[in-house]
Interface confidence: medium
């Protein structure tokens, strides 16, 4: 018996087609993805093949103005239109709290939404009961397939799930649910979830009875043969893991942003054992036409977005200096504003010993692309912020050793004075540079804001200590020469859309007046270029 699994993950509100790098589509003939194009391909496969499941491994939420405006209603609407068969909860599904998950998505979705390792307690238990499930048995042709869900147990640090949801260890939670499916005579079981490729592989290895793992969270691109676009494969598709009980378990993921549709064909014997598996992600490029009816629906929903982007979010009573002449040479107040917003967006009081789990932010000055003039009645709009942060990135959470941070700050000024983008803006960090010293030895003071304290204060960076830092995904991926971050990071979790972080902060503060306040200093008066 043959099953075709179509799968997406980490779509992050890319409902419209995008450019090849998943930012705003400029030249339509070269654009990719989007739900209209995805629907065309899904329908084509559904017509051609008998047993097809369309699955999503989480993180539909968060990533573009679509989510900012529609808050998840767009996810439910268009996933219903595409007739998804099941979805696993990702960490970003909790970005607007539990209410922001229940009302727009859980109550509106016409497909099961799954997670076996999230347990509700207290008053929430009855409120959310039945709205998401640990597993679902789906009829496919003449057979049944069990889908069991899982979600990153780090979600309380990455999003806003509140205090009434407990995130258990994935493997511990999955095993009893899979066992239950076996007692129900379900012998074909897919683990669908959102914990990253390393955990996907562990689930394949450790959870007895799981036949296939369909994952997300780490934006992993797998491919067999010559890849069709810019993404470099982390391994073959499917990635085969030998389980502890000797089975070959295919593990798949489909990169992110709806650029590819994962396509996996599995052959089962009559006892539900996997005999063979093969496939590849399908690049959703312009050779696949956009479905006209879905496209028309997208255009209808788009109207509200255009109106939103010119509305006032808040006011500034100071000039927001995002000029390259400032942000690539010295502390700039636009950099301070963005870093303050990044920290504010990551406030999670999950431990009495810590005022917050993270206190530090770094931001490449080259990522700040425009100032905002306060002489326009002080008005700040989404449109203004899109000029400051035009790349459609995310502000991510990483864990780094102090020694890596020191290298990053040395890189920040290794060729100071050439207006290059690697000069770092900061939050929760005080750095002093001496430019009279040789490159690689210019950081003379680096103090960081404590987290395990009731009164935050600055302490010298410790080389061997592990720190959490919020930074642009561009830096986490080694951009602007920050290879040491990519090479040495100990953990990396994708965060919220950059513009959304800043716009939420401005809306919350109502009036802003960021200052230049001595976060970055130069000894020997080397601060002029």
């Amino acid at each position: 018996w043959e099953l075709t699994i179509l799968h997406t993950n980490d779509v992050h509100s890319r409902l419209e087609q995008t450019s090849e790098d998943s930012s705003k589509c400029v030249n339509a003939s070269r654009c990719m993805g989007g739900v209209a194009r995805l629907f065309t391909k899904v329908q084509q496969i559904r017509r051609a093949e008998p047993n097809v499941l369309l699955l999503d491994a989480g993180d539909q939420y968060q990533g573009t103005i679509w989510f900012t405006v529609y808050k998840g209603a767009e996810v439910a609407h268009f996933m219903n239109a595409l007739r998804y068969d099941a979805m696993a909860l990702g960490n970003h599904e909790f970005d607007n709290g539990v209410e922001g998950l229940i009302e727009p998505l859980l109550k509106e979705a016409k497909f099961p939404i799954l997670s076996a390792n999230i347990k509700a307690k207290g008053p929430l238990a009855s409120q959310i009961s039945g709205l998401y499930l640990p597993y679902k048995v789906l009829p496919v042709g003449d057979e049944v397939v069990g889908i069991v869900g899982y979600t990153s147990k780090e979600t309380p640090f990455l999003s806003n799930p509140g205090t009434n949801l407990v995130f258990e260890d994935e493997i511990t939670a999955l095993q009893p649910e899979v066992d239950k499916l076996k007692t129900l005579n379900v012998n074909k079981i897919i683990a669908l979830g959102h914990s990253g490729f390393e955990m996907d592989k562990l689930i394949a290895q450790k959870v007895r009875g799981v036949d296939v793992v369909v994952g997300g969270h780490s934006n992993t691109f797998l491919y067999t043969g010559n890849p069709p676009s810019k993404e470099v494969p982390a391994g073959k598709y499917p990635f085969i893991v030998t389980s502890d009980d000797g089975r070959k378990v295919p593990v798949v993921q489909a990169y992110a942003f709806g650029k590819y549709l994962g396509y996996l064909k599995i052959e089962f014997d009559e006892r539900g054992n996997v005999i063979s598996s093969h496939g590849n992600p399908i690049l959703l490029n312009s050779s696949i036409p956009e479905d006209p009816s879905i496209k028309a629906d997208i255009n209808k929903w788009r109207i509200k977005l255009d109106n939103y982007s010119t509305q006032e979010l808040g006011k500034t009573i100071v000039y927001l200096d995002g000029s390259s002449q400032s942000c690539r040479f010295r502390e700039c107040n636009m950099g301070n504003l963005i870093c303050d917003a990044m920290i504010n967006n990551n406030l999670r009081h999950t431990d009495e010993m810590f005022w917050n789990h993270v206190s530090m932010c770094i931001l490449n000055g080259g990522g700040i692309r425009s100032p905002i003039d306060e002489r326009n009645n002080g008005t700040i709009t989404w449109e203004n912020l899109a000029a400051v942060l035009p790349f459609g990135g995310t502000f991510d959470l990483v864990q780094l050793k102090g020694s890596t941070l020191k290298k990053a700050f040395e890189h920040s000024v290794h060729r100071y004075g050439q207006s290059t983008g690697e000069f770092l803006q900061v939050g929760g960090i005080h750095v002093v540079y001496d430019l009279s010293r040789k490159p690689g030895d210019r950081v003379v003071k680096l103090d960081v804001l404590c987290t395990k304290c009731r009164v935050p204060s600055y302490d010298p960076l410790k080389m061997d200590e592990v720190y959490k830092v919020i930074l642009p995904n561009f830096l986490a991926n080694g951009g602007d020469g920050f290879q040491m971050i990519k090479d040495e990071l100990l953990r990396h979790d994708s965060g919220d859309q950059d513009i959304n972080v800043v716009s939420t902060y401005i809306s919350k503060m109502k009036v802003i007046y960021p200052a230049v306040e001595g976060r970055i200093k130069f000894s020997h008066h080397h601060h002029h270029h």
Partner: nanobody
Framework: QVQLQESGGGLVQAGGSLRLSCAAS????????MGWYRQAPGKLRDLVAK???????TYADSVKGRFTISGDNAKNTVYLQMNSLKPEDTAVYYC?????WGQGTQVTVSS
């Protein structure tokens, strides 16, 4: 401007060994790590081995088990120990760190 200076190349018989060195004029190994690349006549420059500033190493499949990269942070120097050399290892070997490159050193392996 950072200078990288390679040394240690030369002519050697197949099966023999050479040790290449690359000295940096400034403290960049600590930040970026270093790598060795090679370029045979009419071919593209290929990665041979690299070492991150944290000491993690990567090797091209063709040299695994024969070549060893190591670094001395204090001296801003990286080494490439090449054993069991083959004629196909003949190339100009370049040292690299971030976007800085050395001038190259010729390695010729005769059969």
């Amino acid at each position: 401007q950072v200078q990288l200076q390679e040394s240690g190349g030369g002519l050697v018989q197949a099966g023999g060994s050479l040790r290449l060195s690359c000295a940096a004029s400034e403290n960049i190994f600590n930040i970026y790590g270093m790598g060795w690349y090679r370029q045979a006549p009419g071919k593209l420059r290929d990665l041979v081995a690299k070492i991150t500033s944290g000491g993690r190493t990567t090797y091209a499949d063709s040299v695994k088990g024969r070549f060893t990269i190591s670094g001395d942070n204090a001296k801003n120097t990286v080494y490439l120990q090449m054993n069991s050399l083959k004629p196909e290892d003949t190339a100009v070997y370049y040292c690299n760190s971030y976007y800085y490159w050395g001038q190259g050193t010729q390695v010729t392996v005769s059969s």
